[in-house]
């Protein structure tokens, strides 16, 4: 039975040109995390495999950095980076857990005026 839950940073915002850390945390289960996939809509950003290490998609290698931990750092943000991001945890023996983060990338001037999502 799958008892775990994924905690995420929820809805977040960041300034264009800046960077942001995407973080998920799996709790309430003793299942072993074997792999975490990071996806933007249906596009793979990165994989962190417990045994093989990181795979960063070549399309994003110049502006995606692994970590911290199982998280992912997005750099040189553009408005096009606005959207949904998913962390997909493969675990043993539970199976797959998925978390969702919504990122809005704001023009610097807008961000300075406090138009930000609150983290629930």
């Amino acid at each position: 039975m799958m008892t775990g839950t994924i905690e995420t940073t929820g809805n977040i915002s960041a300034e264009k040109g800046g960077s942001i850390i995407l973080q998920c945390h799996l709790s309430s289960t003793t299942a072993q995390v074997t792999q975490v996939n990071w996806e933007q809509q249906d596009q793979l950003l990165a994989i962190c495999n417990a045994d093989l290490g990181w795979h960063i998609s070549p399309s994003f290698k110049d502006r995606v950095a692994p970590g911290p931990g199982l998280g992912l750092t997005l750099q040189s943000l553009t408005v096009n980076d606005t959207g949904e991001y998913f962390c997909i945890y493969h675990t043993y023996p539970d199976g797959t857990y998925t978390g969702r983060i919504f990122l809005e990338v704001l023009e610097s001037s807008v961000a300075e005026h406090g138009a930000r999502f609150q983290i629930p």
């Epitope: 074997t34 793979l44 994989i47 495999n49 093989l52 070549p58 290698k61």
Partner: antibody, heavy 119, light 107 residues
Amino acid sequence: EVQLVQSGAEVKKPGASVKVSCKASGYTFTNYYMHWVRQAPGQRLEWMGRIDPDSGGSKYNEKFKSRVTITVDKLSSTAYMELSSLRSEDTAVYYCAREGHYGFYSDYWGQGTTVTVSS
Amino acid sequence: DIVMTQSPDSLAVSLGERATINCRVSENIYSYLAWYQQKPGQSPKLLVYNAKTLAEGVPDRFSGSGSGTDFTLTISSLQAEDVAVYYCQHHYGNPLTFGPGTKVDIK
């Protein structure tokens, strides 16, 4: 066009080391991880390890961990695999193979380098 | 290590007929399975990754299916140039391991 061109065949004595090179072209070398896989005569393919050419970080098959070293030279877009303490069972064709876009499989392979270990 | 087995060891199929190769894995690898084709004296060539995604430039007579521990590669209409050994490989953990191969010939 993606190309992985490997160094020529080698004949080595037991106990010696061999270093095989793999020159990449047709893509951005540092954006794609590189794997090394070998195939002994009549045997299945055997994965040896992988490297991130950007950071130099590598992961190895535990079976080879004490004997294999995978390195890169970013300036020449070349990957290297060195295997030490050679024995007759290491006689095989050694392949470099580029990691794919979407995971740890390999989408392009070098032509292979035959390494013969014989006294 | 994750153990890969393939069946059959070899098969002979008439031109234009269907060829089916199975790969069984010792533990759940979700859909992290690749198929390669290796012709005599050549390097392996990627056909399928993530169990069912066809690699660039691969003819659509090839298809992959399955998830978990059981996977299949199908050649819907065998052509003369398909004579080769076919290997499955999981791409899920260390070490990456390959099946023993299935040799496909023309009947």
